[in-house]
């Protein structure tokens, strides 16, 4: 679709005469007749195919028209058209004498008629005018002519439509040649599709507007390159959406079981070795002059009642020192210079020489002990406490200070590790001696009953086209990540233009 | 052939929400070629588009109903849904889901059957 | 808002060409789709992109687009084509039908 223009400039006839040599009267009131069609080699009466155009009277004999003349013509005059150009056309432009009023063909004597021009040719669309001008032996017509597009046509011919657009079927201009030219943030056949932030992941995400980044199911982070770990994940990361992978020291469906106590809490303290011996269980190994579950209790060296016959013991900061009684000497007061003649033996003991009465050795009545029968037994040194118990000494009593898993006077019971439920998802709990053991229902194993071995909900294959299936281990359901180019749940439906006319 | 089909409550009381449902079958309705609307047509008068959807979840509604109306996709059903809450007797009608073709320049090549929501207590 | 016009009715006799106008602010800056309803039924698309025709769409119905009017032509117009007929074009980003023109073949 188009326009043939022709620009009428200047029109002579200084005789003021019609074709047939006849002068007007009183002079040539001249209007125009024009006729476009096709390409004819000899240009011929006949129907004027492209279309016909006439003008009102423009001057008498002589005159110039001007651009957009006055008396209701249009100047250039318009020829449209509604096909594609072709390139080729013969013009006939008529010039008459209007007698009267009226400027119909049938109004006017056939002898009205002042000159006729025909010409034939090329014709390319575009801007530029190009100038001609026709002589005969009584006029002369200067004029111009060029073929446009209408508006929203364009090309060679004018036969490509586009209309500029920018709502959501399009966002786009109009180049020379009538293809697209979308707008920045735009991409696609028509510019509809828009174009993500730049490093948005192109299969985990999408964007509805430019510069967008939208994360597909299982994807977060302002690029969608982050997975998203199992829901409920505490201390454990994911390379592909709901894992749970644990970091160090965690076990467990959701990584929240410590099985490194140690380093999370560092339970020992004054410098002992701590020992993982289970999930929140551990053991602190003490450094020396340290006792305590925690080794958290500082030991006297004096506690172990070094000094014998009677010597008194004094701790030092570098270990202790005994102050032996009269008759005793050495590191421990081990040494006597005494014999049974002193009566070394307290408490009842019996005196007995040894060496030809060099020496001696006193023999103690029940609850009494030491080289000279100075102590009172010490309870704790038949080592009551069974299971690793602490004995402390109490007075006239002693206590076992048990460790964990075990109880009673003497840390002879052992608690039942089943006390605490430890087995998850409805498990049942076995006590044995050296700890406890898990029966899980279906669907799970592990010490615990923690690992979910439920059925794989991806074992069937559910995702298409490549698709990458995972199991979302708290619904037992899956979930599909879609290669480029695919959508919907299972990754079935490709994304792309249609064909165009699916009837 | 594609095919849309509408479906959804008949009867609503005033005030409350009219929700209507269009399955797709015969294609995808996740491709990005298409937007996929809902347009109604009073008893006796003409039609009125409401708004439109994509694959993605891009909305587009009438001004004149923006405040009114919610449509979204279910790329898994291959279903789009319209929910237009306070409804009144003006909003008695027959409604339609479409196809709005990028390629036919938004163009509607297909329609469901349309379905009668009459608005009444 | 944006608004399209019909003339409420068009009559034609049968072989005859009806002309349908829709107009608009600068309708031909927009692409023109025109759809038939017949009583009962859903509507068909007959014209998009201002002039061209859906396959199974006869040659007889035609349209144009340019200026602030936009026209669908039946040529030798028959009596199943008796139906509304509905102008629609795209405001932005808002889908605006025209009021409908009742053809009917005498």
């Known amino acids: 679709s188009g326009v043939f223009q022709l620009q009428l400039q200047e029109f002579i006839n200084e005789r003021g005469v019609l074709a047939s040599g006849r002068p007007c009267e009183p002079g040539c009131r001249t209007f125009f007749r024009v006729c476009l069609k096709h390409f004819q080699a000899v240009v011929s009466p006949g129907p004027c195919t492209f279309g016909t155009v006439s003008t009102p009277v423009l001057g008498t004999n002589s005159f110039a028209v001007r651009d957009d003349s006055s008396g209701g013509g249009r100047n250039p005059l318009q020829l449209p058209f509604n096909f594609t150009w072709p390139g080729t056309f013969s013009l006939i432009i008529e010039a008459w004498h209007a007698p009267g009023d009226d400027l119909r063909p049938e109004a006017l004597p056939p002898d009205a008629l002042i000159s006729k021009i025909a010409i034939q040719g090329s014709l390319a669309v575009g801007q530029n005018w190009l100038l001609d001008e026709q002589t005969s032996t009584l006029t002369r017509l200067r004029y111009s002519y060029r073929v446009i597009c209408s508006d929203n046509y364009y090309g060679d011919n004018c036969s490509r439509l586009c209309k500029k657009r920018n709502d959501h079927f399009g966002h786009y201009v109009c180049q020379p040649d009538g293809n697209l030219s979308c707008l920045p943030g735009w991409t696609g056949e028509y510019c509809q599709q828009p174009i993500c932030l730049s490093g948005c992941h192109e299969q985990n995400g999408y964007c509805s507007k430019p510069a967008e980044c939208l994360c597909r199911p299982g994807w977060q982070g302002r690029l969608c390159n982050e997975c998203i770990p199992h829901n409920g994940c505490r201390h454990g990361t994911c390379s592909t959406p709901w894992q749970c992978t644990c970091d160090e020291g965690w076990g467990g469906l959701f990584c929240d079981q410590d099985l490194n106590y140690c380093t999370h809490h560092s339970p020992c303290k004054n410098g002992a070795t701590c020992s993982n011996s289970g999930q929140r269980s551990y053991t602190c190994t003490c450094r020396p002059g340290y006792t305590g579950v925690d080794c958290e209790l500082e030991l006297s060296e004096c506690d172990s009642n070094p000094c014998r016959n009677g010597g008194s013991c004094k701790d030092q900061e570098d270990g202790y020192h005994c102050l032996c009684p009269p008759g005793y000497y050495g590191l421990h007061c081990e040494h006597s210079t005494l014999s049974c003649a002193d009566s070394p033996c307290f408490n009842g003991g019996s005196c007995r020489e040894r060496n030809q009465g060099a020496n001696y050795a006193c023999e103690c009545p029940p609850n009494f002990t030491g080289s000279n029968c100075e102590k009172k037994v010490d309870r704790c040194t038949s080592n009551p406490c069974a299971n690793g118990g602490q004995c402390l000494n109490r007075g006239p009593s002693r206590m076992c200070r048990c460790r964990p898993g075990f109880t009673g006077t003497y840390c002879e019971l052992h608690v039942s590790d089943c006390a605490r439920n430890p087995c998850a998802h409805g498990g049942t709990c076995h006590d044995l001696e050296n700890g406890l053991m898990c029966t899980c229902p279906a669907g799970f194993s592990g010490r615990r009953c923690e690992v979910r071995t439920s059925i794989d909900a991806c074992a069937s294959s559910p995702c298409f086209n490549r698709a990458t299936c995972y199991t979302d281990l708290s619904t037992d359901t899956f979930v599909c990540n879609c290669p480029y180019g695919f959508v919907g749940s299972r990754c079935e439906f490709p994304v792309g233009l249609p064909p165009s006319f699916p009837w | 052939e594609v095919q849309l089909q509408e479906s959804g409550p008949g009867l609503v009381k005033p005030s409350e929400t009219l929700s209507l449902t269009c399955t797709v079958s015969g294609g995808s309705i996740s491709s990005s070629g298409y937007y996929w609307g809902w347009i109604r047509q009073p008893p006796g008068k003409g039609l009125e588009w409401i708004g439109d959807i994509n694959y993605a979840g891009s909305t587009y509604y009438n001004p004149s109903l923006k405040s009114r109306v919610t449509i979204s996709v279910d790329t898994s059903k291959n279903q789009f849904s319209l929910k237009l809450s306070s409804v009144t007797a003006a909003d008695t009608a027959v409604y339609y889901c479409?196809?709005?073709?990028?390629?036919?320049?938004?163009?509607?090549?297909?329609w469901g059957q349309g379905t009668l929501v009459t608005v009444s207590s | 808002s944006y608004e399209l016009t019909q003339p409420p009715s068009v009559s034609v006799s049968p072989g005859q060409t009806a002309s349908i106008t829709c107009s608009g602010q600068?309708?031909?800056?927009?692409?023109a789709s025109w759809y038939q309803q017949k009583p009962g039924q859903s509507p068909v698309l007959v014209i998009y992109?201002?002039?061209k025709r859906p396959s199974g769409i006869p040659e007889r119905f035609s349209g144009s687009n340019s200026g602030d009017t936009a026209t669908l032509t039946i040529s030798g117009t028959q009596p199943m084509d008796e139906a509304d007929y509905y102008c629609?074009?795209?405001?932005?980003?808002?889908?605006?039908f025209g009021y409908g023109t009742k053809v009917t073949v005498l």
């Open positions: 479409a196809r709005e073709d990028v390629i036919l320049r938004g163009g509607s090549d297909y």
């Open positions: 629609q074009a795209w405001d932005r980003d808002t889908g605006v």
């Open positions: 992109e201002d002039s």
């Open positions: 600068r309708l031909g800056d927009k692409y």
